[in-house]
Amino acid sequence: MKVLQEPTCVSDYMSISTCEWDMNGPTNCSTELRLLYQLVFLLSEAHTCIPENNGGAGCVCHLLMDDVVSADNYTLDLWAGQQLLWKGSFKPSEHVKPRAPGNLTVHTNVSDTLLLTWSNPYPPDNYLYNHLTYAVNIWSENDPADFRIYNVTYLEPSLRIAASTLKSGISYRARVRAWAQCYNTTWSEWSPSTKWHNSYREPFEQH
């Protein structure tokens, strides 16, 4: 039994880090493997993660962590019984994938303006709380070509757009994701999408 693709890990910079790797053949990850992780400092405890299958030869482990601080560094040991398959380290602050934003809502009651709001996925004391920027994806359910991305580079979790920039009388969906430039994070997963029917008063045209 060998590791084909070494574990790569990302942290939500709050409570979970997720490590994924591939074995050289079909593996029952939960029965055959254990990932031990330990914060590097005196008297820290070793924790054991039982991996789950992620495809035939793929494994994934969710590592529970206390509030992350930038200095945190973990040793990782992947075991198959008594055999050490791989040894590495992981610094959560250097491999951040933010949590996905939540509670995406489209407010259509403002005259001819769409207001999209969502929730910051971090509590106010978390470092990422004041460092997230967002991308909002809006697309038409009727027309696959009607697909647009709005970059929200300010901190407020909201976006205003004129309803007239979208077609009237059809349904649209929106979703949002986040990233933090300060930690050079990857993008978060997309939030669950929300749907609304876009309608607005067409301006009177004179011929």
Partner: antibody
């Protein structure tokens, strides 16, 4: 091994105050965020409060906000819960529980609020 | 605040039965969900975290699934020591909230 021992519970009248303590051993207390969780007699679990190891930030359940204060003394390996303006509905066993996500619990201390 | 609704609140089952408990969140919590077991007079112990990750030392007959708002705890073959009360917990945001509990009793 990890151990959490609560104390300070007892009988108190409505409107009164109590200070609960939780002494930790077997791990580096200053590196752990901590919680208080309570359980009224015959009822379910209710999270009460949290204090971060990283920032010292604190959070409270709506039911205790403004009345309870969580604090810690890393030099004494101790977690505290100052409970003021106690009500009948605060009667419960109070547990301290360690992060991440309540991996270790104390045995609890009983707080009875009654006239 | 996020509400966690567990069902059923109580159930009777026999040794060897497959038992399923569900937990519904009032809004999306991704996989930030844990399951705890509590026996009478004892302290709760964590069985599952991150919705589906088995806590080390917990028997493999326990499993968790779900994401978003719908979650399930399954005991594949109920054992005598599994008769207890089970709680779900969301830690996606503060205040953290538990489900009201499911008591699994002997039929």
């Amino acid at each position: 091994q990890v151990q959490l021992v609560e104390s300070g519970g007892g009988l108190v009248q409505p409107g009164g105050s109590l200070r609960l303590s939780c002494v930790a051993s077997g791990f580096t207390f200053s590196h752990s965020s901590m919680n208080w969780v309570r359980q009224a007699p015959g009822k379910g679990l209710e999270w009460v409060s949290y204090i971060s190891r990283a920032t010292g930030a604190v959070y409270y359940a709506d039911s205790v906000k403004g009345r309870f204060t969580i604090s810690r003394d890393n030099a004494k390996n101790s977690l505290y819960l100052q409970m003021n303006s106690l009500r009948d509905e605060d009667t419960a066993v109070y547990y301290c529980a360690r992060e991440p996500v309540f991996d270790y619990w104390g045995q609890g201390t009983l707080v009875t609020v009654s006239s | 605040d996020i509400q966690m609704t567990q069902s059923p609140s109580a159930m009777s089952a026999s040794v060897g039965d497959r038992v399923t408990i569900t937990c519904r969140a009032s809004q999306d919590i991704s996989n930030y969900l844990a399951w705890f077991q509590q026996k009478p007079g004892k302290v709760p112990t964590r069985l599952i975290y991150a919705a589906s990750s088995l806590q080390s030392g917990v028997p493999s007959r326990f499993s968790g699934s779900g994401s978003g708002t719908e979650f399930t705890l399954t005991i594949s073959s109920l054992q005598p020591e599994d008769f207890a009360t089970y709680y779900c917990l969301q830690w996606s945001s503060y205040p953290r909230t538990f489900g009201q509990g499911t008591k699994v009793e002997i039929k």
